[in-house]
């Protein structure tokens, strides 16, 4: 059936940016400014998404795919295609429903994005804290206490606080 | 024993997909980052992107960001990386590594899985 | 993203020899400076991690040393089972990354 389908349907003839126009004998248009088709054998193009407010264009609209967003310095994508933008936060911080607040004391956020997390438990796998958490930072884990020589010193200070400037994901 | 075991080998079309997994034994799985790393014939190794199990939180390198999509599976203790849109520079070996102990260092690799795009 | 800088890309050496290779991430990495080997089967393995700090079970003769933006990887006696490619990478910044590799062989 579908080869049958293909061969009496002229549609099927059109390809990817263009539609099959039924008020024109269903010959192939190529689609409208601002509208694209991504796929063969499409009866209407489909309009073209716009990248508008804090969201900016990643990828301009062609006639065979639709335009990608991304967002605009201070705000980071969410969602499938990047359906959201939201507020960045500093790294040590998260984003709550008031702002941006800093990361509690145990746990750290080395992103501008997301939530603070619990620094990792180095004993859960038998091994010990090298260097200790920030806000900024997780733990460092280091051999276990046993592997450690009588005497040696096993926690390091965290190194000091810095911007690394993590890029926008 | 702690370990990662990934999926064999695949042999795709380009424009196709695939999904590649890697599970993990002898340890927490919800515990711990899971990593893809990339390393295509005679090249160097590159950081694809990472998931937390425990909440399913990722984080994508910009450049594999439309190609790479990073799942886990809790009940099967069982990470997945699908590539989609498949094109002969996909050709590679991707590995699945587990931190050691914080995000920052590897101490645990997968064993690798090639996949190869060829028409 | 910041970029690694590894060399030499290939050297070649006698066993007994001490070996040094160097990683020069672009811009300051603080401590976060991993060092992993790659045998010819393609097994990886990591070596030292946070600069310096030797991963339990790995011999004492794998040393790594330095800090920011200039690191250094020692092997101080090679030993036929060190034929391996060498990678350093940085777990500072997102997205993290690796040099480029230093292929080790033995004259």
């Known amino acids: 059936f579908e080869r049958t389908r293909s061969l009496q349907d002229p549609c099927s003839n059109c390809p990817a940016g263009t539609f099959c126009d039924n008020n024109r004998n269903q010959i192939c248009s190529p689609c409208p400014p601002n509208s694209f088709s991504s796929a063969g054998g499409q009866r209407t193009c489909d309009i073209c998404r716009q990248c508008k407010g804090v969201f900016r264009t990643r990828k301009e609209c062609s006639s065979t795919s639709n335009a990608e967003c991304d967002c605009t310095p201070g705000f980071h994508c969410l969602g499938a295609g990047c359906s959201m933008c939201e507020q960045d936060c500093k790294q040590g911080q998260e984003l709550t429903k008031k702002g941006c607040k800093d990361c509690c004391f145990g746990t750290f956020n080395d992103q501008k994005r997301g939530i603070c997390r619990p620094w990792t438990n180095c004993s859960l796998d038998g091994k010990s804290v090298l260097v200790n958490g920030t806000k900024e930072r997780d733990v460092v884990c280091g051999p276990s206490p046993a592997d450690l020589s009588p005497g040696a010193s096993s926690v390091t200070p965290p190194a000091p606080a810095r911007e690394p400037g993590h890029s926008p994901q | 024993q702690v370990q990662l075991v990934q999926s064999g080998a695949e042999v795709k079309k380009p424009g196709a997909s695939v999904k590649v997994s890697c599970k993990a034994s002898?340890?927490?799985?919800?515990?711990?980052?899971i990593n893809w790393v990339k390393q295509a014939p005679g090249q160097g190794l590159e950081w694809i992107g990472n998931?937390?199990?425990?909440?399913?939180?990722?984080n994508y390198n910009q450049k594999f960001k439309d190609k790479a999509t990073i799942t886990a599976d809790k009940s099967t203790s069982t990470a997945y990386m699908e590539l989609s849109s498949l094109r002969s520079e996909d050709t590679a070996v991707y590995y699945c590594t587990r931190d050691y102990g914080s995000a920052y260092s590897y101490s645990l690799w997968g064993q690798g899985t090639t996949v190869t795009v060829s028409s | 993203d910041i970029q690694m800088t590894q060399s030499p890309s290939s050297l070649s050496a006698s066993v007994g020899d001490r070996v040094t290779i160097t990683c020069r991430p672009s811009q300051d990495i603080s401590n976060y400076l991993n060092w992993y080997q790659q045998k010819p089967d393609k097994t990886v393995k990591l070596l030292i991690y946070y600069t310096s700090r030797l991963r339990s079970g790995v011999p004492s003769r794998f040393s790594g040393s330095g800090s920011g933006t200039d690191f250094t990887f020692t092997i101080s006696s090679l030993q036929p089972e060190d034929i391996a490619t060498y990678f350093c990478q940085q777990g500072d910044t997102l997205p993290y990354t690796f040099g480029q590799g230093t292929k080790l062989e033995i004259k």
């Open positions: 998931i937390y199990p425990s909440d399913s939180y990722t």
């Open positions: 002898g340890y927490t799985f919800t515990s711990y980052w």
